[in-house]
C-alpha cells in the first residue's frame, strides 16, 4: 500500500499545529514531568510486518484524536488550532484505513495485532490518568503536548521506514 504524498505533509502540519498549541512556557513545568512509558517496542520495526505497523500507527492516531477531542482539551487549548488538528488527524486515519484494508483486510487486523494495539491504548490511558490526577492543569497539558509531539515524531519515523522498505 502506498500512502499518498499528502500523508507526510499532513504529518508535518499536525506537528506544527501541536507546537502552536503551546499556552505557557514549558520552562515553568519541569517539576510536572512524567514517565508515560511510551511503548517503544511497538515502534521498533525489526520484527514488524507492514500490516502490523499500519495497525499500530492507526491506533496511535485514533487515540491522539480521542485525547484531543474531549471537552477538557477544548477548554484548555485553542479551538481553531484543535479544529485544524482534527482535520489533519482525520485525513491520516482515512489514509491508514485504506492501507489496512489493502494489506490484511479490515476484519482480521485488529485481532491479529491485539497486543500491540493494547499497548498503545494503555499508554494513552496513562496519559489520561495523569491529566485527571493533575486536574487538567496548564502544566499537565504542556507535558502531555510535549509527549504527544514526541510520540507523533516516532510515528512519523516509523512511517518513513515503512516507505523506504517498499
Amino acid at each position: 500500500c502506498d500512502l499518498p504524498q499528502t500523508h507526510s505533509l499532513g504529518n508535518r502540519r499536525a506537528l506544527i499545529l501541536l507546537a502552536q498549541m503551546r499556552r505557557i512556557s514549558p520552562f515553568s513545568c519541569l517539576k510536572d514531568r512524567h514517565d508515560f512509558e511510551f511503548p517503544q517496542e511497538e515502534f521498533d520495526d525489526k520484527q514488524f510486518q507492514k500490516a502490523q505497523a499500519i495497525s499500530v500507527l492507526h491506533e496511535m492516531i485514533q487515540q491522539t484524536f480521542n485525547l484531543f477531542s474531549t471537552k477538557d482539551s477544548s477548554a484548555a487549548l485553542d479551538e481553531t488550532l484543535l479544529d485544524e488538528f482534527y482535520i489533519e488527524l482525520d485525513q491520516q486515519l482515512n489514509d491508514l484505513e485504506s492501507c489496512v484494508m489493502q494489506e490484511v483486510g479490515v476484519i482480521e487486523s485488529p485481532l491479529m495485532y491485539e497486543d500491540s494495539i493494547l499497548a498503545v491504548r494503555k499508554y494513552f490511558q496513562r496519559i489520561t490518568l495523569y491529566l485527571t490526577e493533575k486536574k487538567y492543569s496548564s502544566c499537565a497539558w504542556e507535558v502531555v503536548r510535549a509527549e504527544i509531539m514526541r510520540s507523533f515524531s516516532l510515528s512519523i519515523n516509523l512511517q518513513k521506514r515503512l516507505k523506504s522498505k517498499e
Epitope: 512556557s25 514549558p26 515553568s28 519541569l30 517539576k31 514531568r33 512524567h34 514517565d35 515524531s153
Partner: antibody, heavy 121, light 107 residues
Framework: EVQLVQSGAEVKKPGESLKISCKGS????????IGWVRQMPGKGLEWMGI????????AYSPSFQGQVTISADKSISTAYLQWSSLKASDTAMYYC??????????????WGQGTLVTVSS | DIQMTQSPSSLSASVGDRVTITCRAS??????LNWYQQKPGKAPKLLIY???SLQSGVPSRFSGSGSGTDFTLTISSLQPEDFATYYC?????????FGQGTKVEIK
Amino acid sequence: EVQLVQSGAEVKKPGESLKISCKGSGYSFTSYWIGWVRQMPGKGLEWMGIIDPSDSDTAYSPSFQGQVTISADKSISTAYLQWSSLKASDTAMYYCARHPGLNWAPDFDYWGQGTLVTVSS
Amino acid sequence: DIQMTQSPSSLSASVGDRVTITCRASQSISKFLNWYQQKPGKAPKLLIYFASSLQSGVPSRFSGSGSGTDFTLTISSLQPEDFATYYCQQSNTLPFTFGQGTKVEIK
C-alpha cells in the same frame, strides 16, 4: 550520531563583544533545549541559561540575566551565547548541552567540547 | 534558587574501594537529580539521571539513590578511570543548579 560542536577558543579584550556557537547534529534540533554552563579556571560548573530552539524561548540564571544573551537559529541547528561587553571575569570555559525539555528522557546527555574564552588587556 | 550542597568536597580512595558521595537540596526536588563525572580538560559526562537511572553506556558500578532532598552517588568498586570530579545537579525547577563538586583522588 548525536553531536554538539562548539566554536573555537577566543582571546578578547575587555569591552569587546563576542558570540560563540554550538551546532547540533544527529538529532532533531528543535526537539531538545540547549543549555549553557560556565566553568571558571579551577572552579565548578555554573548553570547560565537555556533556550528552546523551536521558538527561541529563553530562561536565565539570575546571576547571568542581563550579562549574556542566548539565541538560536533553528534553520542551521545552532545555538549561540553572546556578550556585548566582555569583562576579565568572563574568562572561562563555556559548555553547551542538550536537554529533553518536558519529555521523560536523560537531562544534559550530550555536551559540546567547550569553548575557552580568555578576556585580557 | 535551590541550593545544592555536596559532601565531601574531596576524598582519597584506593582502587577497589566503595565510594559514596552525598548531595542535599535546599528544598524538595522529587527525583529530578542528575550526577555528572568530569575529568580535567574534558566536558562533563552524565552518569545518573532522575536520581537512580543509569545513563546508557555507564558501568553498573555507578548507582544513585534518594528523593526529596537527600541523594547519594555510589561507586561500588572504584576503578583507575573513576578518579575525577563529580557534580550533582537539580532539574526540578529553573534555574538549574549544580553542587560544588566532589574531587575523588588516589590515596
